[in-house]
């Protein structure tokens, strides 16, 4: 059985205010069963950026259809970027549990920073 890896290929992503940013995340295995969530930051205070199952994320859309059974792409797009969006974003795999899901593995993170405005 292949051990799951969380792949976030970009270490740094330069974005432009007002544009849409794409944060890439793919997994190498469908197991263990459980959701992938997106966070900004680390530690107890990390901010939830996207949870497919529940929540309100008006500026976030998924690149792929997460409801497809064999989906391994958990990339997201964040629209209308502002300076307040900078930070390091992590996709995190949870293992389905009862009553709570358990954090299983995190991607290495992608730092989103503001790039120069296009001339």
């Amino acid at each position: 059985e292949e051990e799951l890896q969380m792949i976030q290929p970009e270490k740094l992503l330069l974005v432009t205010v007002g544009k849409t940013a794409t944060l890439h995340c793919t997994v190498t295995s469908l197991l263990p069963v459980g959701p992938v969530l997106w966070f900004r930051g680390v530690g107890p205070g990390r901010e939830l950026i996207y949870n497919q199952k529940e929540g309100h994320f008006p500026r976030v859309t998924t690149v792929s259809d997460l409801t497809k059974r064999n989906n391994m792409d958990f990339s997201i797009r964040i629209s209308s970027i502002t300076p307040a969006d900078v930070g390091t974003y992590y996709c995190v795999k949870f293992r389905k549990g009862s009553p709570e899901n358990v954090e299983f593995k995190s991607g290495p993170g992608t730092e989103m920073a503001l790039g120069a405005k296009p001339s």
């Epitope: 900004r40 930051g41 530690g43 107890p44 205070g45 901010e47 309100h56």
Partner: antibody
Framework: DVQLVESGGGLVRPGESLRLSCAAS????????VTWVRQAPGEGLEWVSL???????YYADSVKGRFTISRDNSKSTLYLQMNGLRAEDTAVYYC???????????WGLGTLVTVSS | EIVLTQSPGTLSVSPGERATFSCRAS??????LAWYQQKPGQAPRLLIY???TRATGIPARFSGSGSGTEFTLTISSLQSEDFAVYYC??????????FGGGTKVEIK
Amino acid sequence: DVQLVESGGGLVRPGESLRLSCAASGFTFTNYAVTWVRQAPGEGLEWVSLISVTGTTYYADSVKGRFTISRDNSKSTLYLQMNGLRAEDTAVYYCAKVTWKNVFDYWGLGTLVTVSS
Amino acid sequence: EIVLTQSPGTLSVSPGERATFSCRASQTVGSKLAWYQQKPGQAPRLLIYDANTRATGIPARFSGSGSGTEFTLTISSLQSEDFAVYYCQQHTDWPPYTFGGGTKVEIK
């Protein structure tokens, strides 16, 4: 505007219980960790407890085993169940929103808990 | 647990003057240090995080500096509304989140 409003404080005797509430508005409650910080009369700030966005709970050693933090995302409300209260728990209890930087960017006005016989 | 020590305990300053006070950590916190302001009867307010980044809406007269174990908060020209107690907090090693004991800035 972000608003945090604590309630539930009051005067209790040592050994008794109290449940504090903090009603949040002006931000997407489910997306942020929230915390309790207390301040004894004339003293400095002391962190008490935090609950993360996924429901993981953290406590200061001084309250571990006596206090329980919880959140009701459907009501955008944070709670602190305080059992076995002691005189040294007397303080103003503030709830605060936690940023992804692990700092506390918005605070309520606080609710006073007095433990005295 | 990281212990934060603030000095001085009280600082007497005249309006318009510069105020500088410090926060020392018992072990390195990198740049992960925040400052809060608290006025009597009010909740604390976040001023600075990451040692030198001003929080939203904080005037430019407040500036933070330092890294590792030694940090400074400077108010370039004290206004009447700046007389308050100032607390530092480390945000690198949790739990617990720890605060300094505070520096009271009073009118000279």
